[in-house]
């Protein structure tokens, strides 16, 4: 018979044969041949793996790193990685939670909605036409432009979402 | 590892004052939005106090406004949080933070007891 050109769901081609993939958990030690069966062993102790696979090496589960304020929120298992949290107050930088902030900073162009709580981060908004703010902050929100009007001044620059308003000299029409 | 340094907590009276320090040994503040955050026996951490890199902005919690005042001394290195009028509430580990408000920044902090 004709070698196989592709396998079904769970199997691997190799040396034109179908071979059955390691279930997860496990990792494989050696190929199938014509008369023998795929070769897995489980995953060790703090390792794993999280699908039907052909890897030779299981990965390590995550260290939730306490000198980054990481606690372990759920333990690895031989199929799945170490879920980690922040400590009590404190906020993940990413979904993937590497690292811990106290609270995020609401960056320029964007005001704090609301401050942060041991419970939620910082809320941020974009600031409205008519407010900038231009700095990194976790408390403060978009202030509005300069209102030149009420300095006798004129808008000599206009103001965006990260800039105040520039205002200057009204031009004085010669006699 | 480069750690924030509060100091000036201490055993304090009802109606009492204390100013709290926050140093940092190694690397710069000027410029940097600060915090000074607490954390009272059995609670959560409290955002107490903020001011801007620039020191024109501040920012007081409900619960101290009117009583504490925030400030810095770029030249110094330092934060200062001038604590009046002190209540038993008030009682806790004061820690400084420092934009972008990392763990590994984070210092042992400084306790304050408020009590007669």
């Known amino acids: 018979p004709e070698p196989p050109t592709a396998c079904r769901e769970k199997q691997y081609l190799i040396n034109s044969q179908c071979c059955s993939l390691c279930q997860p958990g496990q990792k494989l030690v050696s190929d199938c041949t014509e008369f023998t069966e795929t070769e897995c062993l489980p995953c060790g102790e703090s390792e794993f793996l999280d699908t039907w696979n052909r890897e030779t090496h299981c990965h390590q589960h995550k260290y939730c790193d306490p000198n980054l304020g990481l606690r372990v929120q759920q333990k690895g298992t031989s199929e799945t990685d170490t879920i980690c949290t922040c400590e009590e107050g404190w906020h993940c930088t990413s979904e993937a939670c590497e690292s811990c902030v106290l609270h995020r900073s609401c960056s320029p162009g964007f005001g704090v909605k609301q401050i942060a709580t041991g419970v939620s981060d910082t809320i941020c908004e974009p600031c409205p036409v008519g407010f900038f703010s231009n700095v990194s902050s976790a408390f403060e929100k978009c202030h509005p432009w300069t209102s030149c009007e009420t300095k006798d001044l004129v808008v000599q620059q206009a103001g965006t979402n990260k800039t105040d308003v520039v205002c200057g000299p009204q031009d004085r029409l010669r006699a | 590892e480069v750690q924030l340094l509060e100091s000036g907590g201490g055993l304090v009276q009802p109606g009492g004052s204390l100013r709290l320090s926050c140093a940092a040994p190694g690397f710069t503040l000027a410029g940097y939005e600060m915090w000074w955050v607490r954390q009272a026996p059995g609670k959560g951490l409290e955002r107490v106090s903020a001011i801007s890199g620039s020191g024109g902005s501040t920012y007081y919690a409900d619960s101290v406004k009117g009583r504490f005042t925030i400030s810095r001394d770029d030249s110094k290195n330092t934060l200062y949080l001038q604590m009046n009028s002190l209540r038993a509430e008030d009682t806790a580990v004061y820690y400084c933070?420092?934009?972008?408000?990392?763990?590994?920044?984070w210092g042992q902090g400084t306790l304050v007891t408020v009590s007669s």
């Open positions: 933070a420092k934009e972008p408000y990392s763990f590994d920044y």
